[in-house]
Interface confidence: low
């Protein structure tokens, strides 16, 4: 048959951050190409990345249709130069991916501190709300729009002159913290989804921002 010399894909892996979702697999093709199908668990499969020589396929536009749905993908292997034949009755070799539920499994991207503003002994720290490719009514949603109160941020802050860190938490994108007057502070934030019990419940820490630099503003 036409598929006897093709090798089934393996090591199918979902790579997803802030809902940008790529399916990766092996092996690098030698005389074969791949087509990916994704199922919204309806029993129907939608084909993507037709006859590609890549070993990855961007499935973001499919999974963002319903990020709380659970998806399964499969990768078909075809001989290089394959042209689909309507007379073919044999399915090519394929491999199933693990299940993937974007809402539960997408990694949280590294957050960014948008600004901080000191007023007396208070500092207001604002976390930049990242945009995602999730849409509602033709509008792209932010990470906060998607996760709502499921998403919190943890702020780590410390005096520039010491290493003792303090923490604060918020379920918005803003912190209001007490600081000692006349002291400079440094800040880092981390996105967290407390309801998750897996390794992807926290993002990496944001880049450190310190008072006295351009993102800050000080008012008495």
């Amino acid at each position: 048959s036409g598929t006897t010399n093709t090798v089934a894909a393996y090591n199918l892996t979902w790579k997803s951050t802030n809902f940008k979702t790529i399916l990766e697999w092996e092996p690098k093709p030698i005389n074969q190409v791949y087509t990916v199908q994704i199922s919204t668990k309806s029993g129907d499969w939608k084909s993507k990345c037709f006859y590609t020589a890549d070993t990855e396929c961007d499935l973001t536009d499919e999974i963002v249709k319903d990020v709380k749905q659970t998806y399964l993908a499969r990768v078909f292997s075809y001989p290089a130069g394959h042209v689909e034949s309507t007379g073919s009755t044999e399915e090519p070799p394929y491999e199933n991916s693990p299940e993937f539920t974007p809402y539960l499994e997408t990694n949280l991207g590294q957050p960014t501190i948008q600004s901080f503003e000191q007023v007396g002994t208070k500092v207001n720290v604002t976390v930049q709300d990242e945009w995602t490719l999730v849409r509602r009514n033709d509008t792209f949603l932010s990470l906060r729009d998607v996760f709502g109160k499921d998403l919190i941020y943890t702020l780590y802050y410390w005096k520039s002159s010491s290493s003792g860190k303090k923490t604060a938490k918020t379920n918005t994108n803003e912190f209001l913290i007490d600081v000692d007057k006349g002291e400079n502070y440094c800040f880092s934030v981390q996105a967290v989804i407390p309801s998750r019990r897996t390794a992807n419940r926290k993002s990496t820490d944001s880049p450190v921002e310190c008072m006295g630099h351009e993102k800050g503003e000080s008012r008495e």
Partner: antibody, heavy 117, light 112 residues
Framework: QVQVVESGGGLVKPGGSLRLSCAAS????????MSWIRQAPGKGLEWIGI???????YYADSVKGRFTISRNTNENTVYLQMNSLRAEDTAVYYC???????????WGQGTLVTVSS | DLQMTQSPSSLSASVGDRVTITCRAS????????LSWYQQKPGKAPKLLIY???KLASGVPSRFSGSGSGTQFTLTISSLQPEDFATYYC????????????FGQGTKVEIK
Amino acid sequence: QVQVVESGGGLVKPGGSLRLSCAASGFSISSYDMSWIRQAPGKGLEWIGIIGSNGRTYYADSVKGRFTISRNTNENTVYLQMNSLRAEDTAVYYCARGLYDGTGNIWGQGTLVTVSS
Amino acid sequence: DLQMTQSPSSLSASVGDRVTITCRASQSVYGNNWLSWYQQKPGKAPKLLIYGASKLASGVPSRFSGSGSGTQFTLTISSLQPEDFATYYCQGTYYSGDWYFAFGQGTKVEIK
């Protein structure tokens, strides 16, 4: 013609072993998921296990550790190795293609296995 | 484990009757609708009627229909024909890292 044909059934004593074969024609077993299902006399259908197109196997709890599904892609045949057989394993054993999403679903005619002393 | 419970276990009906068989899963089937219905006649292998809860298999008459989602499913025969007297099984698919399949205990449709 796309079909599957089971063979290897027969009479076996309790504690004995038997290997069933499922010969596929008209398609390649390396491209499909193949299941074994059984039906005890006068009873309903019971799923035994499946070998995926990737060669991975999954089993029902009732047969885990006793039954093994394998395949020979060169011969285009799927096997069910049954060990430590019990009287309650007496059934017609069916081989079927494509239980995952319902498409491409093909069943064989079945082969009878009788476990009795 | 996934368990499928059909009701009724048997029923008597006449040609032309509308027949409904229900199937309940102990937990949601894969994708909420990876649920198939089979027809089996004595001494024969099962024949696929419905897959994906509501999709008609190739060559199956349109008097057969399926509905439902999650854990509750229904097979309906809109107008029972003489050749429809048989046993019907639902079959659910479950996936949680391992694939698992389960059949209902069957519903025998007999002539009244």
